[in-house]
Interface confidence: low
């Protein structure tokens, strides 16, 4: 960042999107600002318009190509600049030498579905979205289950330390409504972070058979 009150954070989704957030204390809300991306080894550059997300922060997505195209590699460097209009000229407000595969945040897992449900257990699968083939199997997942009367924040985290796109939830209560979420993270990258949580999948366990112990 250009000064101490500015924060410029970006993540690469491993395929064709860099998402950026810029926050600046005392910045004018009506100033027009953009993020400019200049790769060191590619014959393209890209710009996105920063849009306000709060009083002093702006966000935008650099769309580098079609969603599943592999636009950057582990040795790419992308110079990212925040440029804000000052009258007839543009002023650089922040700059960073962005290493895409050191700053990864994948898309949330998709296509969650119940494979099999019983009274006390439920098998759920999902798919990863727009994840680079470079990762091979070097991914991990976190999952959580929302029980009645609890919040997501209270839900214990289950960790899957390998690329496993399913889970078998055990010790569930019969005839009970649950929700399930999962997120993914590559093992690569110093500043890599978890993907957003998936859309919740609602499911209900089967009722216990009448006359039987549960």
């Amino acid at each position: 960042a250009v000064n101490g009150t500015s924060r410029f954070t970006c993540f690469y989704n491993s395929r064709a999107n860099i998402s950026c957030v810029w926050s600046q204390d005392g910045a004018l809300q009506d100033t027009s600002c953009q993020v400019h991306a200049w790769p060191d080894r590619r014959r393209w550059n890209q710009t996105c318009e920063l849009l306000p997300v709060s009083q002093a922060s702006w966000a935008c997505n650099l769309i580098l190509g079609t969603p599943d195209s592999q636009k950057l590699t582990a040795v790419d460097i992308v110079t990212l600049r925040v440029m804000c209009r000052e009258g007839v000229r543009w002023r650089m407000m922040a700059i960073q030498d962005f290493k895409p595969f050191e700053n990864l945040r994948l898309m949330a897992p998709i296509s969650l579905q119940v494979v099999h449900v019983e009274t006390h257990r439920c098998n759920i699968s999902w798919k990863i979205s727009q994840a680079s083939h470079y990762f091979e199997r070097h991914l991990e997942f976190e999952a959580r289950t929302l029980s009645p009367g609890h919040t997501w924040e209270e839900a214990p985290l289950m960790t899957l330390k390998q690329k496993q796109e399913w889970i078998c939830l055990e010790t569930l209560t019969p005839d009970t409504q649950y929700e399930f979420q999962v997120r993914v993270k590559p093992l690569q990258g110093e500043f890599t972070t978890w993907s957003p949580w998936s859309q919740p999948l609602a499911f209900r366990t089967k009722p216990a058979a009448l006359g039987k112990d549960t």
Partner: antibody, heavy 119, light 106 residues
């Protein structure tokens, strides 16, 4: 016209340090990365490191403990400092820049500056 | 590090001859470059991204290849082509060069 001009070469004692400058003209070092490559007498080319337009660096791991690349944007100049020099560091040192498409290989080179490490 | 091995290490050919230099990478590379270096001079970029001719470079120079195997060709050798030629990869750090091929006129 893009130009790179190295300076600071000469005779250095073993165990000493060298500080080279690469003065850029025709472009700004806030817009382009500058690389350093060396060539020992009668030998091939060896990439040493790079300083990116935003100021971060990448080094050849073989030199990372004794190499520092920095720059002064106001002077449009890149600096190369190497410590603990030994005879095998005797070489012509070049700074280089990629082409106008921001990545076209090393399209621009300085003339090189000779560093001799000897007692 | 990726090793780049050029062959031959030197060659002698007549003016007008077709000259071919190969560059073998120790692992697959995506971006390959060729440079010409005349004695006492800085290298000059000839070919970028495997097969693209750099600005101002005569069309008798060409490049091809993929993966681990690349080729550089001078279709009709000229006296001013006397130089050492280097390949270079830019797929993984550190960037590495071949050991060079010295081209001489018979």
């Amino acid at each position: 016209e893009v130009q790179l001009l190295e300076s600071g070469g000469g005779l250095v004692q073993p165990g000493g340090s060298l500080r080279l400058s690469c003065a850029a003209s025709g472009f700004t070092v806030t817009s382009y990365a500058v690389h350093w490559v060396r060539q020992a007498p009668g030998k091939g080319l060896e990439w040493l490191g790079v300083i990116w337009s935003g100021g971060s660096t990448d080094y050849n791991a073989a030199f990372i403990s004794r190499l520092t690349i920095s720059k002064d944007n106001s002077k449009n100049t890149v600096y190369f400092q190497m410590n603990s020099l030994r005879a095998e560091d005797t070489a012509v040192y070049y700074c280089a820049r990629a082409g106008d498409a921001n990545y076209d290989g090393f399209a621009y080179w300085g003339q090189g500056t000779l560093v001799t490490v000897s007692s | 590090d990726i090793q780049m091995t050029q062959s031959p290490s030197s060659l002698s050919a007549s003016v007008g001859d077709r000259v071919t230099i190969t560059c073998q990478a120790s692992q697959s590379v995506s971006f390959l470059y060729w440079y010409q270096q005349r004695p006492g001079k800085a290298p000059r970029l000839l070919i970028y991204d495997t097969s693209n001719l750099a600005s101002g470079v005569p069309s008798r120079f060409s490049g091809s290849g993929s993966g681990t195997s690349y080729t550089f060709t001078i279709s009709s050798l000229q006296p001013e082509d006397i130089a050492t030629y280097y390949c270079q990869q830019w797929s993984t750090y550190p960037l590495t060069f071949g050991q060079g091929t010295k081209v001489e006129i018979k």
